[in-house]
């Protein structure tokens, strides 16, 4: 099975690398745009220079293109806890992050938010918090997991997965129950 | 104790609109980050929408940009979501939530409201 090409790759798919056909012109390869440019012209003809044109402050093109407008620059989500890493250029996209001591938990693809790394108390680090996962804690005897926190078993209901972990615990509460019940 | 309560769902045909209320309660609403997350039949949950607490530059995933807007009225302490162009995709339990703040989890979210596009 041949794949399906869209419009434009079967446009550029006709041209050598680095080039385009000509939108009016089928018989015309036209020189792609620089990263940090855009298409302000088409080449007037073969052999002839495509007018690009540099993206203006707040837009970029990461890579070479024939698009007709730069990119909007992201902005970070402040609400999200983002930080700059590194501002927006003509080739480059905003770069965002989260503060030190934080990781990255994506919602979706395009979005995500920083939380700060999990410490272990009443534990110890298995494994260390790194950039897009929290720490990974084992909790002491007589606490469990909980959102990544490590509970007291005094805080583990029946009903809960916590009682295989709190077993003797749960068992020691369940007695005391039972003895003055008489 | 916090509360949310939406409102709005029902049955819409592909192309329709449907606009979804979010009251709010119990905290101050004005202060918080709001969020519109969806779970569609047999599916997790997806993140829709969120909108800041001064209503500027809201998030839209890439599914919804373009036809859902998000708004909110913080005299009114209620979260909106009008949803145009709907489509048959858009089928799901919708839910409004306050933006997590100690992991990714949501501590507090409302009960949810049925939206289903179907001809």
């Known amino acids: 099975l041949v794949p399906h090409l869209g419009d434009r790759e079967k446009r550029d798919s006709v041209c050598p690398q680095g080039k385009y056909i000509h939108p009016q012109n089928n018989s015309i390869c036209c020189t792609k745009c620089h990263k940090g440019t855009y298409l302000y012209n088409d080449c007037p003809g073969p052999g002839q220079d495509t007018d690009c044109r540099e993206c203006e402050s707040g837009s970029f093109t990461a890579s070479e293109n024939h698009l007709r407008h730069c990119l909007s620059c992201s902005k970070c989500r402040k609400e999200m806890g983002q930080v700059e890493i590194s501002s927006c250029t003509v080739d480059r996209d905003t770069v965002c992050g989260c503060r030190k001591n934080q990781y990255r938990h994506y919602w979706s693809e395009n979005l995500f938010q920083c939380f700060n790394c999990s410490l272990c108390l009443n534990g110890t680090v298995h494994l260390s918090c790194q950039e897009k996962q929290n720490t990974v804690c084992t909790c002491h005897a007589g606490f469990f997991l909980r959102e990544n926190e490590c509970v007291s078993c005094s805080n583990c209901k029946k009903s809960l997965e916590c009682t295989k972990l709190c077993l003797p615990q749960i068992e020691n509460v369940k007695g005391t129950e039972d003895s003055g019940t008489t | 104790e916090v509360q949310l309560l939406e409102s709005g769902g029902g049955l819409v045909q592909p192309g329709g609109s449907l606009r979804l209320s979010c009251a709010a309660s119990?905290?101050?609403?004005?202060?918080?980050?709001m969020v519109w997350v969806r779970q569609a039949p047999g599916k997790g949950l997806e993140w829709v929408s969120h909108?800041?607490?001064?209503?500027?530059?809201?998030f839209y995933a890439d599914s919804v940009k373009g036809r859902f807007t998000i708004s909110r009225d913080n005299s009114k302490n209620t979260l909106y979501l009008q949803m145009n162009s709907l489509r048959a995709e858009d089928t799901a339990v919708y839910y409004c939530?306050?933006?997590?703040?100690?992991?990714?989890?949501?501590?507090?979210w409302g009960q949810g409201t049925l939206v289903t596009v179907s001809s």
């Open positions: 939530a306050l933006l997590p703040k100690r992991g990714p989890w949501f501590d507090y």
């Open positions: 119990g905290f101050t609403f004005a202060h918080e980050t």
């Open positions: 909108i800041p607490p001064d209503g500027q530059d809201p």
